[in-house]
């Protein structure tokens, strides 16, 4: 007897973080034997949507013409082949921004920081919120932090970073949210440019030194203060 059908791949274009009113396309890719694709949304009646496969039958498109609160959430997809339904895909978390007013992002003591020292990014909201998210432009893992103060409403969140290295430099934004839906975020804060100057680093070349300047896990503050990461929006904890 054959084993279970391999799970499909689920992704969103242009991405999984979408501003209110913008369009998004959800793709589910299975196998060439797929006859039908099904998309389920957590806490919604299943199936949320069904689609026939696009030629050559190995994927289906689910379109959202205008992003609203109703579409934000956690999705999984399946495909049906002649032998039955596949395993579920890994979840896709579709996040809508623009649900609340934008917070303010600042750097303490300054956005100009010397390599080898520390900097704390402070995200402040006008109204009390319980979840704050920090993102870095062009990062390999753009959603850096989800933090929750165990339901406690606060006006700010601190994101400590140390030691700062050259890859921490770049443009950051933050979002705020309420715990009842981790998929609804505020408008983004105005961008904050973090500039890393000087160097306390070893000047000798390292044989394993990365030549890529793209921001990756290396520039990510991995332990948000006082937080217990939620399952939703979790991007880079182990």
């Amino acid at each position: 007897q054959a084993g279970p059908l391999p799970k499909p791949t689920l992704w969103a274009e242009p991405g999984s973080v979408i501003s209110w009113g913008n369009s998004v396309t959800i793709w589910c890719q299975g196998t060439l034997e797929a006859r039908e694709y099904r998309l389920d949304k957590e806490e919604s009646p299943a199936p949320w949507d069904r689609q026939n496969p696009l030629e050559p039958k190995n994927k289906a498109r689910f379109s959202i013409p205008s992003m609203t609160e109703d579409y934000a959430g956690r999705y999984r997809c399946y495909y049906r082949s002649p032998v039955g339904w596949s395993q579920p895909s890994d979840p896709l978390e579709l996040v809508m921004t623009g649900a609340y007013s934008k917070p303010t992002l600042s750097a303490l003591p300054s956005p100009l920081v010397t390599s080898g020292k520390s900097v704390t990014l402070l995200c402040q909201s006008r109204s009390p919120m319980d979840t704050f998210l920090l993102i870095k432009e062009r990062a390999a893992h753009p959603l850096l932090h989800l933090r929750s103060e165990h339901g406690a409403q606060q006006h700010q969140a601190e994101f400590p970073m140390s030691p700062v290295t050259s890859v921490h430099g770049g443009t950051y934004r933050c979002f705020s949210s309420h715990g009842f839906s981790h998929y609804l975020l505020s408008h983004p804060s105005d961008p904050l440019e973090l500039i890393v100057s000087g160097s306390l680093e070893d000047p000798r070349p390292s044989p394993t030194r990365s030549v890529s300047t793209a921001a990756g896990p290396e520039d990510q503050p991995l332990m948000p203060t006082g937080s217990v990461p939620h399952s939703g929006l979790r991007r880079h904890w182990e």
Epitope: L108, P109, S115, G116, K117, S118, T120, E158, P160, M161, S162, P163, T165, S166, V167, L200, E201, D202, R204, S206, T208, R209, S210, S212, G216, P217, E218, Q220, P221, L222, M223, T225, H236, E238
Partner: antibody, heavy 118, light 107 residues
């Protein structure tokens, strides 16, 4: 579960060399900066070196700069400390530790002992 | 380098006591202060990071506070398993530096 296991310690003559290894498991090694910290007998902890997750940033304590080299092999989940021109004051228990990105070291190995003596 | 001073090198207390260990830094470290526990067998564990944040799995009887140059670790309701040496460490500026340690013993 995060697990760090150091190896490579032992008795070394003054002026000699030694390479320590730290095998990591239970987490995505390539996503974390790593440290070496040492503790001389009956003394406190002393930070030795740091290497960022992609090896693009490396820092040393002044006491070891020019003599020690920290490196890592991400595909093999292994951290290294190459020690040369060893001195009696380098005698210590050497620990590897995982960096958090917030100035702390959240998981430590059990340590490997290095004795520099003739 | 930032100097770290733990003025009390050893401390004796009774089970159930509330114990406070102090750490002073030579300059403002902006709350980048961490506390570690080293057991007699050499095992080192992170207890508190960023002054007051409890590391996962650490009992809630441990707490941290402070700002600027003065920080403290408090153990409420001292337990037998808390017998260890406690080190503070600043993570504000490399090189990272440790306090000399405070050895906690049971009366």
């Amino acid at each position: 579960e995060v697990h760090l296991v150091e190896s490579g310690g032992g008795l070394v003559q003054p002026g000699g060399s030694r390479k320590l290894s730290c095998a990591a498991s239970g987490f995505t090694f390539s996503s974390f900066g790593m440290h070496w910290v040492r503790q001389p007998p009956e003394k406190g902890l002393e930070w030795v070196a740091y290497i960022s997750s992609g090896s693009s940033s490396i820092y040393y304590a002044d006491t070891v700069k020019g003599r020690f080299t920290i490196s890592r092999d991400n595909p093999k989940n292994t951290l290294f400390l190459q020690m040369t021109s060893l001195r009696s004051e380098d005698t210590a228990m050497y620990y590897c530790a995982r960096g958090t990105g917030t100035g702390a070291m959240d998981y430590w190995g059990q340590g490997t002992s290095v004795t520099v003596s003739s | 380098d930032i100097q770290m001073t733990q003025t009390t090198s050893s401390l004796s207390a009774s089970l159930g006591d509330r114990v406070t260990i102090s750490c002073r830094t030579s300059q403002d470290i902006s709350n980048y202060l961490n506390w570690y526990q080293q057991k007699p067998d050499g095992t080192v564990k992170l207890l508190i990071y960023y002054t007051s944040k409890l590391h996962s799995g650490v009992p809630s009887r441990f707490s941290g506070s402070g700002s600027g140059t003065d920080y403290s670790l408090t153990i409420s309701n001292l337990d037998q398993e808390d017998i260890a040496t406690y080190f503070c460490q600043q993570g504000n500026t490399l090189p990272w530096t440790f306090g000399g340690g405070t050895k906690l013993e049971i009366k």
